[in-house]
C-alpha cells in the first residue's frame, strides 16, 4: 500500500566461508531523506520495546561516523535510494537474515534480505541444451549464484581434465534483480564427444581450485562405422570369395536399418553386417561401403575397393591426336581392361611390330609422314596376354611439299608479252585447294595452279606461288628476267654547275634508268643532226649558237629510247650592239628623231646607257631615245652602252644631223 | 569418498525378471552415466548398458535389448537393473560402475543366480 | 561395437618374470581432443570386483606399483608387468571406453 517504503534487492545472496558478499539495493522513502541506519543480523521485534532486537552489524550514526569494528560491513547507499551493502569477508554464521532498520524524519521501515552463506565454496551448476546432435553448435552454460567485487573468481571449462579449447565467455550480474556469474561455452560437438566427461570448474583469482560440476555428455550421432574385408587388400581373382563384414563402432540412438553399397548404388537382399560375394566376377569390381541408420540419420563406413583380377581383354588404340600435323607430338594409348593393370606392352605399326615400344603409351615427338599408318597393340598382365583389337588410324596431315612456280614461255621474255606460269609441288596432306601468287596483280588464273600475265611488265621482276591445303607452302621466287628498251633516258648538264656563260667548258651527260639486256649505243642530236655517240656531249668554249634543243637517243637489242629534248641556255654580255635612228639620220629641226639601242644579250639587256658626242652620259635609260622636238644642236654623234647579268657591251657611234626647217631658213 | 553399493544376492526362477539397485554417494548422482556390466562365472566382463540420471537417458547392449531395462531415483540416487526373461545362462554376477575424469569405481557385485 | 581381442588366454610364470600381455581394438580408441587412448587394464581376482590399474593406456591409477606400466595407441596396446609378484597372479582385462564399453576375454596369469 501507499504507507510502504519501496525496496529492489535480491531476495536472497549466495556466498561462502571467506568470500564477501555484495548486496545491490535501492529504496524509496515515505518523505524525506535517511535519517537513521541500523543493519541486523537475524533482527526479532520485542513488542515491549517496540523496537526490534539483534545482533547490529553496522550502525549510522548522526554525525555519520562509524565504530572501527563496523570496517567488515559497509554501506555503501546514500540517503534518499542507494541501499547497497558489502560484507568482506562473509562468515558461516552471517548466514540468516539481515535487516535494514530504516529512518526518516516520521517513518520507520525493517526490510529483510536473505543471505545463505556456505562452509565451502559452493558448485556452479552446468546447463545442457536438451538434445545435442554432432556438428551442431550448442551452448554449454555454467552458472554460479555468486558475484562479489571484493573477491573475483573465473570459470574454467575442462574435457575429460583438459581445458577446453574453445573460448568461453564470462559474464557477471550484480544488479537489484540478480546475482551470479555466468560462463558460456560454444563447441560444435563431435560423435566422439559422447560419453565424455565436461566439467566447469570454479576457480579462484589465482586459479586455485575452489569447486566444480561435471556432466556426461550425450551425443546424438549418427552410426560411425568400420568396414573389414577378407582377404584385407580385397584383392581377388574372378571365381574367389569375398567376405565384408561391417562394425558399428558408436550409435546414439540404437541403430535400426544396415544396408549394402556398391558404387554408391544399395546392393537388393544384403541387410546383415556381413556382405558374403561368391565366385566374383569382374564387374563386380568397385567401391563398396555399409550404410547403417538410426534416427539421427544414415552413417556411411569408408569404401573397400574391391579388384577382381582378370587377364587384360582386347585392346584398342587411342591416337591424340589424329589427324597429326607433321612436326607435332603425337601420343598413342593402349586401353585395355584389366586387372591388375597390365605391366607389359606389344605395338605394331602397319602390323609389323615396333621395336623397344613396351610401354602403355607410345609417345612420338616429332610426327613425320610416314608416320601414318594403322597402329595396333596387345597388353599383357600376371594373369595372361591380351588380344590385338582392330587398331586406330593415324593420318599425318602436312603442307605441300616441293613446291615450285614453272615459266611455261619461251625465253627471253620481253616487256609487254604474255606469260604463263604454273605451280607444281610432290604431295600434299590434304589435297590442295587453292594457290596464291606474289606479288599480288590482276592476273588472270585460266585453271587451277596457272597465272597468265597479259602484256608483261618491264618491272615484273619474280613471281612466287604457294600451293595451299589447310596450309600453305610457297616455292622461292622466279625471276621472269623481262627484257625492254632502255627506260627513263634524260639529258643531265654534267657542268658547269651552275649557268652557262658564252665561253664555258660544257658537258651533257646521257642518263638512264635501267635497260635489259644492259648494253647500249647513244646518240645525240640537235635540230635532227647528229653530234656524238658518246654518252657525254662536251663542248670546250661554248659560244651562244652552240645554245638550242638537244635531244640523246639510247638503244639496245629490244629497241631505243629517246629522252625528251633538252634546251642549252648560252648567257653572254651584250654584244653587236648599234644604235639605229627613225625616221633617220638626217631630221628637220621640229620633228621628232628616235634612237635606238640594238643589241644581242643573253640574258636580255637590262640596263641602258646613252652617251652623246662628248662623252657625255644622258639621263635617258631606256633602250629608246626619243627626241622630240628635234633641234639643230641635237646633231652629233651618239652611242649607247648595254648591261645585263653578264657585263656590258656598247655601240660605236652613230650621227644623227639635224637641219634647219624652211621656216627658220625663211626667217634668216 | 564415491561408494556405490549393490543389492544382497537373488535366485530366480528361469523365465522370472530381477532388479538390482546401486547406491551411490560421495559425489553429484546426476553428473555421471551408471553403468552396468555382468561377468558369468569363467566368462568375461560384458557390458549391459548405462543411464544418465540427468536425464534419464538410457543405451543398452543389444544382446540384452527388450530383456533390460535401467532407471534411476534421483531423490535416493539409486539406479536399478532389471532383467526380465531370465534364463540359466543369465547366471552371474552383475556391477554398477562409473567413470571418473581418470579413475572408475565399482559397485561390489550382486550374485543373481537363474535356477529351476 | 568396438571389439577387444587379447592374447594370450592364459600364462604360466614364475615370481620375478617379466610378463607381457596384448590387446588389440578392432579400431581406434584414441580420441583426438584430448589426445588420449581410452583403453584401461584391469586385474581381477577371484570373488572380487575388477581392480583399476592402468587407465589412458598408459597411466598407473593412484596405488598401484610401478613394476605395472601401460603403453601403444591407436588399436594396439600392451600390459607389461616388470617382476611378477605372488599377489600379482590373476585374470588380467582390457576395456575401451571411447565408445560405451568393451572388455577383452580376459589373461589369466598362472604360477608355472
Known amino acids: 500500500d501507499s504507507s510502504k517504503w519501496v525496496f529492489e534487492h535480491p531476495e536472497t545472496l549466495y556466498a561462502w566461508e571467506g568470500a564477501c558478499v555484495w548486496i545491490p539495493c535501492t529504496y524509496r522513502a515515505l518523505d524525506g531523506d535517511l535519517e537513521s541506519f541500523i543493519l541486523f543480523h537475524n533482527p526479532e521485534y520485542n513488542k515491549n520495546t517496540s523496537k526490534f532486537d539483534g545482533t547490529r552489524l553496522y550502525e549510522s550514526t548522526k554525525d555519520g561516523k562509524v565504530p572501527s569494528e563496523q570496517k567488515r560491513v559497509q554501506f555503501l547507499g546514500d540517503k534518499n535510494k542507494n541501499c547497497t551493502l558489502s560484507i568482506h569477508p562473509v562468515h558461516l554464521n552471517d548466514s540468516g537474515q539481515l535487516g535494514l532498520r530504516m529512518e526518516s524524519k516520521t517513518e520507520k521501515w525493517m526490510e529483510r534480505i536473505h543471505l545463505n552463506v556456505s562452509e565451502r565454496p559452493f558448485p556452479p551448476h552446468i546447463q545442457l541444451p536438451p538434445e545435442i546432435q554432432e556438428s551442431q553448435e550448442v551452448t554449454l552454460t555454467c552458472l554460479l549464484n555468486f558475484s562479489c567485487y571484493g573477491y573475483p573468481i573465473q570459470l574454467q571449462w575442462l574435457l575429460e581434465g583438459v581445458p577446453m579449447r574453445q573460448a568461453a565467455v564470462t559474464s557477471t550480474s550484480l544488479t537489484i534483480k540478480s546475482v551470479f556469474t555466468r560462463s558460456e561455452l560454444k563447441f560444435s560437438p563431435q560423435w566422439s564427444h559422447h560419453g565424455k566427461i565436461v566439467t566447469c570448474q570454479l576457480q579462484d583469482a589465482d586459479g586455485k581450485f575452489l569447486s566444480n560440476d561435471t556432466v556426461q555428455l550425450n551425443v546424438k550421432h549418427t552410426p560411425k562405422l568400420e568396414i573389414k574385408v577378407t582377404p584385407s587388400d580385397a584383392i581377388v581373382r574372378e571365381g574367389d570369395s569375398v567376405t565384408m563384414t561391417c562394425e558399428v563402432s558408436s550409435s546414439n540412438p540404437e541403430y535400426t536399418t544396415v544396408s549394402w553399397l556398391k558404387d554408391g548404388t544399395s546392393l537388393k537382399k544384403q541387410n546383415t553386417f556381413t556382405l558374403n560375394l561368391r565366385e566374383v566376377t569382374k564387374d563386380q569390381s568397385g567401391k563398396y561401403c555399409c550404410q547403417v541408420s538410426n534416427d539421427v540419420g544414415p552413417g556411411r563406413s569408408e569404401e573397400v575397393f574391391l579388384q577382381v583380377q582378370y587377364a587384360p581383354e582386347p585392346s584398342t588404340v587411342q591416337i591424340l591426336h589424329s589427324p597429326a600435323v607433321e612436326g607435332s607430338q603425337v601420343e598413342f594409348l593402349c586401353m585395355s581392361l584389366a586387372n591388375p593393370l597390365p605391366t607389359n606392352y606389344t605395338w605394331y605399326h602397319n602390323g609389323k611390330e615396333m621395336q623397344g615400344r613396351t610401354e602403355e603409351k607410345v609417345h612420338i615427338p616429332k610426327i613425320l609422314p610416314w608416320h601414318a599408318g594403322t597402329y595396333s597393340c596387345v597388353a599383357e598382365n600376371i594373369l595372361g596376354t591380351g588380344q590385338r583389337g582392330p587398331g586406330a588410324e593415324l593420318d599425318v596431315q602436312y603442307p605441300p611439299k616441293k613446291v615450285t612456280t614453272v615459266i611455261q614461255n619461251p625465253m627471253p621474255i620481253r616487256e609487254g608479252d604474255t606469260v604463263t606460269l604454273s605451280c607444281n609441288y610432290n604431295s600434299s596432306n590434304p589435297s590442295v585447294t587453292r594457290y596464291e601468287w606474289k606479288p599480288h596483280g590482276a592476273w588472270e588464273e585460266p585453271s587451277l595452279g596457272v597465272l597468265k600475265i597479259q602484256n608483261v611488265g618491264w618491272d615484273n621482276t619474280t613471281i612466287a606461288c604457294a600451293a595451299c591445303n589447310s596450309w600453305c607452302s610457297w616455292a622461292s621466287p622466279v625471276a621472269l628476267n623481262v627484257q625492254y628498251a632502255p627506260r627513263d633516258v634524260r639529258v643531265r648538264k654534267i657542268k658547269p654547275l651552275s649557268e652557262i656563260h658564252s665561253g664555258n667548258s660544257v658537258s651533257l651527260q646521257c642518263d638512264f634508268s635501267s635497260s635489259h639486256p644492259k648494253e647500249v649505243q647513244f646518240f645525240w642530236e640537235k635540230n635532227g643532226r647528229l653530234l656524238g655517240k658518246e654518252s657525254q656531249l662536251n663542248f670546250d668554249s661554248i659560244s651562244p649558237e652552240d645554245a638550242g634543243s638537244y635531244s640523246c637517243w639510247v638503244n639496245n637489242s629490244i629497241g631505243q629510247t629517246a629522252s625528251k629534248a633538252w634546251t642549252l641556255e648560252v648567257l653572254y654580255a651584250p654584244r653587236r650592239l648599234r644604235v639605229s635612228m627613225s625616221p633617220g639620220d638626217q631630221v628637220m629641226e621640229g620633228k621628232s628623231a628616235t634612237l635606238t639601242c640594238e643589241s644581242d644579250a643573253n640574258p636580255p639587256v637590262s640596263h641602258y646607257t646613252w652617251f652623246d658626242w662628248n662623252n657625255q652620259s644622258l639621263p635617258y635609260h631606256s633602250q629608246k631615245l626619243r627626241l622630240e622636238p628635234v633641234k639643230v644642236q641635237h646633231s652629233g654623234a651618239y652611242w649607247c652602252q648595254g648591261t645585263n647579268s653578264v657585263g656590258k657591251g656598247r655601240s660605236p657611234l652613230s650621227t644623227l644631223t639635224v637641219y634647219y626647217s624652211p621656216e627658220t631658213i625663211g626667217r634668216r | 569418498q564415491v561408494q556405490l553399493v549393490q543389492s544382497g544376492a537373488e535366485v530366480k526362477k528361469p523365465g522370472a525378471s530381477v532388479k538390482v539397485s546401486c547406491k551411490a554417494s560421495?559425489?553429484?548422482?546426476?553428473?555421471?552415466?551408471l553403468h552396468w556390466v555382468r561377468q558369468a562365472r569363467g566368462q568375461r566382463l560384458e557390458w549391459i548398458g548405462y543411464?544418465?540420471?540427468?536425464?534419464?537417458?538410457?543405451e543398452y547392449n543389444r544382446i540384452f535389448k527388450g530383456r533390460v531395462t535401467i532407471t534411476a531415483d534421483k531423490s535416493t540416487s539409486t539406479a536399478y537393473m532389471e532383467l526380465s526373461s531370465l534364463r540359466s545362462e543369465d547366471t552371474a554376477v552383475y556391477y554398477c560402475a562409473r567413470r571418473g575424469i581418470t579413475t572408475f569405481y565399482w559397485g561390489q557385485g550382486t550374485l543373481v543366480t537363474v535356477s529351476s | 561395437d568396438i571389439q577387444m581381442t587379447q592374447s594370450p588366454s592364459s600364462l604360466s610364470a614364475s615370481v620375478g618374470d617379466r610378463v607381457t600381455i596384448t590387446c588389440k581394438s578392432s579400431?581406434?580408441?584414441?580420441?583426438?581432443?584430448?589426445?588420449?587412448?581410452?583403453l584401461a587394464w584391469y586385474q581381477q581376482k577371484p570373488g572380487q570386483a575388477p581392480r583399476l590399474l592402468i587407465y589412458?593406456?598408459?597411466t598407473r591409477e593412484r596405488g598401484i606399483p610401478d613394476r605395472f606400466s601401460g603403453s601403444g595407441s591407436g588399436t594396439d596396446f600392451t600390459l607389461t608387468i616388470s617382476r611378477l609378484e605372488p599377489e600379482d597372479f590373476a585374470v588380467y582385462y582390457c576395456k575401451q571406453y571411447l565408445s560405451s564399453w568393451t572388455f577383452g576375454q580376459g589373461t589369466k596369469v598362472e604360477i608355472k
Open positions: 579400431q581406434s580408441v584414441l580420441y583426438s581432443a584430448v589426445e588420449k587412448n581410452y
Open positions: 543411464i544418465n540420471p540427468r536425464n534419464d537417458y538410457t
Open positions: 589412458w593406456a598408459s
Open positions: 560421495g559425489y553429484v548422482f546426476t553428473s555421471y552415466w
